[in-house]
């Protein structure tokens, strides 16, 4: 997989009116690293990895540039024309990236209340836009907005790839995102017994990185996919990543049942609690991931946020 | 590829105990089961347990508990199976087994022989 | 535990035959149904595990069927090598159970 740096920038406007400040989250190869403190107007390091190793001047310089893009984002905002009453939100996501064979790309997305309307190629200049007519009216109104702004020249386009796949660089060799193997926690729970079944859950955190295999077995014999059910593998917001898979067992057959994980060349069979271990365990077994901190905003306000 | 080199034939009298070894090549031992199958002369195949190489956990034939004892030592990717009061029905030819996690015994040993005889 | 039955011990077919073997399991095993092959020497091999799947490596010529308690290994067309007995076994339930095997010969 390639390095990659990523900001996801969203403005809101309530009845034509755009609100004041924005909001901001940055990842570092998947991982969120950055937040967007809107009460302190301050870009945070998101996580301990992301404080332990970046300096000061790292959240000064993201804080400059995070305030210049949050302030273009919503002076474009305040060009779209069709506005009706109501929330409204304009979201950027803008990517660079570096390859194994050093090639680079960029690009950057935008969003208009959740929809994509506008994709521009960093390096080529290139833009996509979608067939909608709704994309083609907004992606007009937008372009139509830069060209009369002098700053949205050739050159600010490299301007911004070139600063991004510096800013990357420096990320790198700071070691956030050294390639470190992190081996899973693996941790195998029931839930309550219904109609002579029990649900069995294999959690796996703290693992870096994020590629991993886990898989049910019966007897040694991994289950079919139909019978199984898997979480994504998501960010825990510590540089590493959390994910699960679940299955229906019969109540009495737990010691057929093992959870098989196979990360960074390393492997492990966790087999089923049973008895007093069963009970205690029972408790836990709630696959829904908690979204914190900036996509509640979101959520509270009812605005699709695209990852 | 994948290869189970079972322990040679054994001779041993009413009453004795006898350790059949299965040394595993070609795959990760850790990853995969290894299950134990008796095979009486020309009769048919019994399932007498498994063992997970990784943690130990044994699985067993009802049949067979108090019988037979499954272990492995994973420096030297070997497993074992020992057979304790042998009589005359333990005479038979024992099999180890092996999968590829898609199926049950999907390899084989290629057996050993246990003759029971005073 | 469950019985698995084949009920033909022995079957005399001639080389380039089509040959079914039959195996019946005492109750519903959904489709946990592998096929083994136990050559004169001893030597085992796994041919077709869940009913009819080929184990890879495993000549085309050999095919599983069957659902519920009634399952059936088919050769299509019998070669030399294909002299051995042959074993269906269950893995829905334990205790995992064999058929008594079927002797396959050259008429």
């Known amino acids: 997989e390639p390095h990659s740096l990523r900001y996801n920038l969203m403005v809101l406007s309530q009845d034509g009116s755009v609100q004041s400040g924005f909001l901001a989250e940055g990842h570092l190869d998947g991982q969120p690293f950055l937040r967007y403190d809107r009460q302190k107007r301050r870009a945070k390091p998101q996580g301990q990895w992301a404080e332990d190793v970046l300096g000061a001047k790292t959240w000064d310089t993201e804080t400059e540039d995070l305030t210049e893009n949050g302030q273009d984002l919503r002076r474009t905002l305040t060009h779209i024309k069709d506005q009706k009453g109501g929330l409204h939100s304009l979201q950027e996501i803008r990517v660079c990236e570096i390859h194994e064979d050093s090639s680079t790309r960029g690009s950057r997305h935008f969003y208009y209340d959740g929809e994509l309307f506008l994709s521009q190629n960093l390096e080529t200049q290139e833009s996509t836009v979608p067939q909608s007519s709704r994309a083609q009216t907004l992606a007009m109104n937008v372009t139509n907005f830069w060209k009369e702004d002098a700053m949205k020249t050739k050159t600010h386009y490299r301007a911004m790839q070139a600063d991004c796949l510096q800013k990357l660089q420096r990320y790198l060799k700071s070691g956030v995102a050294i390639r470190r193997t992190v081996p899973p926690m693996v941790n195998v729970t029931c839930s309550e017994v219904s109609e002579g079944n029990i649900t069995v859950t294999c959690r796996a955190s703290s693992f870096y990185p994020r590629n991993i295999t886990l898989t049910w077995r019966q007897d040694g014999v991994s289950l079919s996919h139909n019978t199984q059910q898997w979480g994504d593998v998501l960010p825990d917001g510590n540089g590493t990543y959390q994910t699960w898979v679940a299955t229906r067992i019969r109540q009495g057959e737990e010691q057929r049942f093992t959870c098989y994980m196979e990360h960074s060349g390393n492997h492990g069979t966790h087999p089923v609690p049973s008895g007093k271990a069963l009970v205690l365990q029972s408790q836990r077994t709630d696959h829904h991931h908690h979204h914190h901190g900036l996509n509640d905003i979101f959520e509270a306000q009812k605005i699709e946020w695209h990852e | 590829q994948v290869q189970l080199q079972q322990s040679g034939p054994e001779l041993v009298k009413p009453g004795a105990s006898v350790k059949v070894s299965c040394k595993a090549s070609?795959?990760?031992?850790?990853?995969?089961?290894i299950y134990w199958v008796k095979q009486s002369h020309g009769k048919s195949l019994e399932w007498i347990g498994y063992i997970d190489p990784y943690n130990g956990g044994t699985v067993y034939n009802q049949k067979f508990k108090g019988k037979a004892t499954l272990t492995v030592d994973k420096s030297s990717s070997t497993a074992y199976m020992h057979l304790n009061s042998l009589t005359s029905e333990d005479s038979a030819v024992y099999y180890c087994?092996?999968?590829?996690?898609?199926?049950?015994?999907?390899?084989w040993g290629q057996g050993t022989l246990v003759t029971v005889s005073a | 535990d469950i019985q698995m039955t084949q009920t033909t011990s022995s079957l005399s077919a001639s080389l380039g035959d089509r040959v079914t073997i039959s195996c019946r399991a005492s109750?519903?095993?959904?489709?946990?149904l592998n096929w083994y092959q136990q050559k004169p020497d001893g030597t085992v091999k796994l041919l077709i595990y869940?009913?009819?799947r080929l184990h890879s490596g495993v000549p085309s010529r050999f095919s599983g069927s069957g659902s519920g308690t009634d399952y059936s290994l088919t050769i299509s067309n019998l070669e030399q090598e294909d002299i051995a007995t042959y074993f269906c076994q269950q893995g829905n339930t334990l205790p995992f159970t064999f058929g008594s095997g079927t002797k396959l010969e050259i008429k």
């Open positions: 869940y009913t009819s």
């Open positions: 070609g795959y990760a031992f850790t990853k995969y089961n």
């Open positions: 087994a092996t999968t590829d996690g898609y199926s049950l015994f999907t390899y």
């Open positions: 109750q519903d095993i959904s489709n946990y």
